[in-house]
Interface confidence: low
Amino acid sequence: AGVFELQIHSFGPGPGPGAPRSPCSARLPCRLFFRVCLKPGLSEEAAESPCALGAALSARGPVYTEQPGAPAPDLPLPDGLLQVPFRDAWPGTFSFIIETWREELGDQIGGPAWSLLARVAGRRRLAAGGPWARDIQRAGAWELRFSYRARCEPPAVGTACTRLCRPRSAPSRCGPGLRPCAPLEDECEAPLVCRAGCSPEHGFCEQPGECRCLEGWTGPLCTVPVSTSSCLSPRGPSSATTGCLVPGPGPCDGNPCANGGSCSETPRSFECTCPRGFYGLRCEVSGVTCADGPCFNGGLCVGGADPDSAYICHCPPGFQGSNCEKRVDRCSLQPCRNGGLCLDLGHALRCRCRAGFAGPRCEHDLDDCAGRACANGGTCVEGGGAHRCSCALGFGGRDCRERADPCAARPCAHGGRCYAHFSGLVCACAPGYMGARCEFPVHPDGASALPAAPPGLRPGDPQRYLAGVIAVIVVVVIAIVAGIVVLVISRKKRMAKYEKAEIKEMGEMHRELNA
C-alpha cells in the first residue's frame, strides 16, 4: 500500500502567441481545482475509462477575478497535495490524467457551476520511494507545471511497496529472521518470501515462492523489460520460435477490477476486492449514497439510502449530468416567449422582449395603449400586441410621431381652399358651399347662387361672418386641448398601474432566479 502524491506548481498561459482568455471575470469570479486520475500500465486509455489506480480531487483554490490589461498571470492554486492512495502494489508504470476545473461563484441557480478548463494526460515509469519527478504539460494555450512521486505507507517498502517492514522487537536489534529495513532505521524488514532471485525492483509477491512482475517487465524473475523480450508472443503457453515460456492469459490479466479494486484468481474465475465506496463483480458499482452528497449545484438526490441502491440526481434548471456537474446553455431551453431574446448573464437569465410584450419571460401580452404608444394626442386602438394609432390632425405615421400636411389629402370639397392651421385645417369654401369641409350647398334646391352665409348672418356682412368662423375655431381648439389633458391624465394613471405591475414582476423574477 502507498500514496501517489501530486503537487501542482502553476497553471497559467503557456509560452507563445494566443494567450488564453482568463477563466474568470469581474461579473463571474471563480476559483480553480484539480482532479487526478491514475491508471496502471502504459496503455493510452480514454479519459472516460475507470481510474483503476484511483483518483483524487483537490481543495478549491482562492477566489480569482481577471485583471484587465495586466499580463495573464498564473492562476491562484489550491493549497496542499493531491493524494491518491493505492492499496496494492505500485505498478511502476502508469498513465495519468490531470484535469483543471473552474468553479464559477456567481449567484447562478443552484449554487456554483463547474466546467472543465484543461485536461492533460501522460504515461510514465516511476518507482515508489524515489524523489519527486517534475513535469510540464500543455493543453491548448494553457500550461500546467507539477511534480509527483509514489511513496509507500508503512509497513510497506520497496519500489513497488510490496516488501513489508515490521517494527523492531527490541530497541537494539531486529527480531528473529528480520533484517533492518532501509531507509527506515527503526524498522526491520520481513523475510523475503518471493521466489529466489525475483527482482526486488520489478517483481513482487503476495504468496511465498511467487514472482509477479510489475507492468513493463517479464520473465520468471521479472528481469526482462517487455520491450526487449525475445518472446514474440506475449500470450500463449509458449513460443516455438524462441523457446521462451510465458504464462498464459490469466483471469486477472489486465486487472478487470475497476475503480482501484484488486484482483485475485479463483479456481474458476477471479474475485475483486473493492475499495471503500465501490461494489459489484468488477467494483463497477459506486457505493456512494445520498448521505455522501453526490449531487452538485443544488441537485436533489433520490435513493442511495443503503449500499445496494444507486442514487439519482434530479438537477435544477441550468444543470445536467449524472451528478448535475454540467452547466447547460439555459437559453437553449427557449425560456423567452413571444419572440423575446434570451440573455444568459451567468448569475441570471434576462429576456429582452419585443414591443407589445413584458414580464420575466415576455409572457404578458401588453395592453399596448398603456405604453404611451401613440404620440401627439393620437388615440390607441387595441389590437393583439400590434397597436394602431388614430392620429390627431396634423400628425401621421404608425405612432403619430410624423408631422402630416393636413391639406395633402385635399379635404375641402367643391373647390374649397385648404389652409393648414395649428389645430388642424380650415376650408375657405367656394361661393354656394358651406360646412367644415365645404360639403353642403347653401341652397340645395338651387334657388340661389349667392355666396352662402351661416344662418343669422346677412349676406354682405363679412366682418360678422369672419367673427363667427373664429369663434368656431376657438371652441374647437379648446375642445382639443381639453381632450389631450384628459388623455394624458388617464394614461398616467394607467402607466402607474402598469409600472407597479412591472416592479412586482421583476421582484418575482428575481426571487425565482435566486430560488
Partner: antibody, heavy 119, light 107 residues
C-alpha cells in the same frame, strides 16, 4: 503619479439619486478595475462594487439591492457611481479605489466624496 | 457574507513600542487579507495584502501574519506618524468586507 480625483460634496433629499465621479490619471485607465467603497459616520468601510473599464462588466454588493450602478467613460478616464432611492442611512463618504493586481486589492484611493441625505 | 472582526477597537502604545492588531474572519479566507491605514485629510493607504506581503513604499516596521481565519498586523516600533485608524479587509470573495477598525494612539 497615480491620482484619483473625486467630485465634490452633495446634499440630496430622500428618494433622490446621486452620481459621484472619479477621474483617474497617471496610469492606463482601462487596465485596472475600479472599486467603490463607502463609509457612513462612525461605521466600517463597506464595499459597493467593482467595474472593469475595458468592457464595463461590473459586480455589485447585493446589499444594495440594485440601487447602485457603476459606469465608466473611458474617453474621459472617469468612473461613476450612481446610487438611487437615497435614504438617510446612505449619508456617507464615498470612495473610488483602484484594484492593483491579481492578489492585491485597492492600492490607490480617491479622496472621498461626502454625500448627505436629508429632508 | 464573510464578517471581519477586529480587536481591539482602540490601542494606546508608547512611541517605539510594539502595537498589535488582530483580525478574525467568520470563515477561512486562506491568506487573502489586506490592511489599510486611514488618516484624516489623507487618502487611504494599502499597507499589507495577501496576509503578509508588504506594499511597496510601506516602512518595514509594518508586518502582517496569519492565514485561514486569524490575522495580525504588527507595528514593531510605533512612530508618531503611525497614529491612524487601521482596517482589515478580506479579498477572498465577493462581497469584499472590512473589519470595524482599530484606532491607534500614542500613550
Amino acid at each position: 503619479e497615480v491620482q484619483l480625483v473625486q467630485s465634490g460634496a452633495e446634499v440630496k433629499k430622500p428618494g433622490a439619486s446621486v452620481k459621484v465621479s472619479c477621474k483617474a490619471s497617471g496610469y492606463t485607465f482601462t487596465s485596472y478595475w475600479m472599486h467603490w467603497v463607502r463609509q457612513a459616520p462612525g461605521q466600517r468601510l463597506e464595499w459597493m462594487g467593482v467595474i472593469d473599464p475595458s468592457d464595463s462588466l461590473a459586480n455589485y454588493n447585493q446589499e444594495f439591492k440594485g440601487r447602485v450602478t457603476i459606469t465608466v467613460d473611458t474617453s474621459a478616464s472617469t468612473a461613476y457611481m450612481e446610487l438611487s432611492s437615497l435614504r438617510s442611512e446612505d449619508t456617507a463618504v464615498y470612495y473610488c479605489a483602484r484594484d492593483s493586481t491579481v492578489v492585491a486589492p485597492m492600492d490607490y484611493w480617491g479622496q472621498g466624496t461626502t454625500v448627505t441625505v436629508s429632508s | 457574507d464573510i464578517v471581519m472582526t477586529q480587536s481591539p477597537d482602540s490601542l494606546a502604545v508608547s512611541l517605539g513600542e510594539r502595537a498589535t492588531i488582530n483580525c478574525r474572519a467568520t470563515k477561512s479566507i486562506s491568506k487573502y487579507l489586506a490592511w489599510y491605514q486611514q488618516k484624516p485629510g489623507q487618502t487611504n493607504k494599502l499597507l499589507i495584502f495577501s496576509g503578509s506581503t508588504l506594499q511597496s513604499g510601506v516602512p518595514d516596521r509594518f508586518s502582517g501574519s496569519g492565514s485561514g481565519t486569524d490575522f495580525t498586523l504588527t507595528i514593531s516600533s510605533l512612530q508618531a506618524e503611525d497614529v491612524a485608524v487601521y482596517y482589515c479587509q478580506q479579498h477572498h470573495e465577493y462581497p469584499y468586507t472590512f473589519g470595524g477598525g482599530t484606532k491607534v494612539e500614542i500613550k
